[in-house]
């Protein structure tokens, strides 16, 4: 029987920057049962806090309300693992909230195939952004990616959209069902996982372009 | 404890090209981003890039955009800073370093000398 | 991008003397979200660079309460309030605010 081995605050995880999320892993519990405490300050402060929260992040985790996250503020952060035989603690871990988001998928994603009299056919897409984000005070810039394949296809093809909502593709192939999918990350964060896939359908007529990339 | 061992110095010819690698320790490397840093012999440091080991998103200093490349293996919790074209200009310590979840570096590599010379 | 200007270029100070450092930065460094970005990294002779200041004026962990910083928008200052021999080496002002991150050119300081 042994102290607890050290843990790690391995993931720190914000949707929106008003609210966030850490994760930690335990070390080995050297054979006995092992409580975890997350403890933290503020940049500035002395007074070390207490997780306000261990439920809601599922487990060995600590959430930080609304009330308890400050963009402003840096929090440094350690966990402590405790049994009979003694204690170890992790790292410690310097939490900027801007640095930590990962946003949900983009909202909405429409795909039509447009076929104007002069000019070549394309595959023309938009989306929103995620309901949670509030792009309008400029905290955030969000950028996006496509990625779209045929529906058999292994390999998907991805491209970058930069900051627009919408894109066109010239070049696809005629006949195929297309699955197309968006993502999005703020400029200091973490890509959003993948939208659900919209399908669309490519005529059998789609004239093929010659160039490969897309146009803003 | 966190450890970030670079690989060792290497001489190159001008136009040639050198890989720095950077392997991490002590933590779990996909979840920090690792940053490139540069000091030539007597002079100050300049910011090369940044990758996310979990999705190999890249972020590059235009003056190295084209002629940097970062990389991660994650099997082995390795990054790596190839460097192309390269000129007498380049010959430095190349540094790697890590953030926590923030914009300043807490850990740092020992460096890799990299000469260029003819 | 951000230029950062460092003065002095060298300061020789006595033990236990207080001493200071310059950092300027060619455009405001305070973020979109408020915050500013700008931290001080001591690299003694022949090791890396190691934090010593973040934010401004928030010590890193280990990091001696004689070491301050302070400052706002383009005008940055670190105080060291007592030298001791430990403290030789090449201080560095960095920004990372704007991409791409820059650092000051350094101020050597020595212990006369």
């Known amino acids: 029987q042994l102290p607890p081995g050290k843990p790690e605050i391995f993931k720190c995880r914000s949707p929106n920057k008003e609210t966030f999320t850490c994760w930690w892993r335990p070390g080995t519990d050297g054979g006995l049962p092992t409580n975890y405490s997350l403890t933290y300050h503020r940049e500035g402060e002395t007074l070390m806090h207490e997780c306000p929260d261990y439920i809601t992040g599922g487990p060995n985790s600590c959430h930080f309300g609304k009330q308890y996250t400050s963009m402003w503020r840096t929090y440094v952060m350690m966990v402590n693992a405790t049994n009979q035989m003694g204690s170890s603690f992790s790292d410690e871990l310097y939490v900027d909230v801007t640095y930590i988001v990962q946003p949900d998928p983009p909202l909405e994603l429409t795909v039509e195939v447009k076929q104007p009299e002069d000019r070549k056919p394309y595959l023309w897409m938009k989306w929103s952004p995620p309901t949670l984000i509030d792009l309008k005070t400029g905290w955030f810039t969000l950028l996006y990616e496509i990625r779209l394949k045929p529906e058999k296809a292994a390999e998907w093809e991805t491209h970058f959209a930069g900051q627009q909502t919408e894109f066109k593709i010239l070049s696809l192939h005629p006949g195929q069902k297309y699955l197309v999918q968006v993502r999005c990350k703020p400029d200091h964060g973490y890509w959003s996982a993948w939208s659900p896939a919209t399908f669309i359908q490519i005529p059998s007529d789609f004239i093929m372009n010659d160039h490969h990339h897309h146009h803003h | 404890e966190v450890q970030l061992v670079q690989s060792g110095a290497e001489v190159k010819k001008p136009g040639s090209s050198v890989k720095v690698s950077c392997k991490a320790s002590?933590?779990?490397?996909?979840?920090?981003?690792m940053h490139w840093v540069r000091q030539a012999p007597g002079q100050g440091l300049e910011w090369i890039g940044v990758?996310?080991?979990?999705?190999?998103?890249?972020n590059y200093n235009q003056k190295f955009k084209g002629r940097a490349t970062l990389t991660v293996d994650e099997s082995s919790s390795t990054a790596y800073m190839e460097l192309s074209s390269l000129r007498s200009e380049d010959t430095a310590v190349y540094y790697c370093?890590?953030?926590?979840?923030?914009?300043?570096?807490?850990?740092w590599g020992q460096g890799t000398l990299v000469t260029v010379s003819s | 991008d951000i230029v950062m200007t460092q003065t002095p270029l060298s300061l020789s100070v006595t033990p236990g003397q207080p001493a200071s450092i310059s950092c300027r930065s060619s455009?405001?460094?305070?973020?979109?979200?408020?915050?500013?970005?700008l931290h001080w990294y001591l690299q003694k002779p022949g090791q890396s660079p190691q934090l010593l200041i973040y934010?401004?004026?928030n010590r890193f962990s280990g990091v001696p309460d004689r070491f301050s910083g302070s400052g706002s928008g383009t005008d940055f200052t670190l105080k060291i309030s007592r030298v001791e021999a430990e403290d030789v080496g090449v201080y560095y002002c960095?920004?990372?605010?704007?991409?791409?991150?820059?650092f000051g050119g350094g101020t050597k300081v020595e212990i006369k």
């Open positions: 370093a890590r953030g926590d979840y923030s914009n300043w570096f807490t850990y």
């Open positions: 002590g933590y779990t490397f996909t979840s920090f981003w």
């Open positions: 990758i996310d080991p979990s999705d190999t998103y890249t």
């Open positions: 455009q405001r460094l305070v973020h979109s979200n408020g915050n500013t970005y």
């Open positions: 934010k401004v004026s």
């Open positions: 960095s920004q990372s605010t704007h991409v791409p991150w820059t």
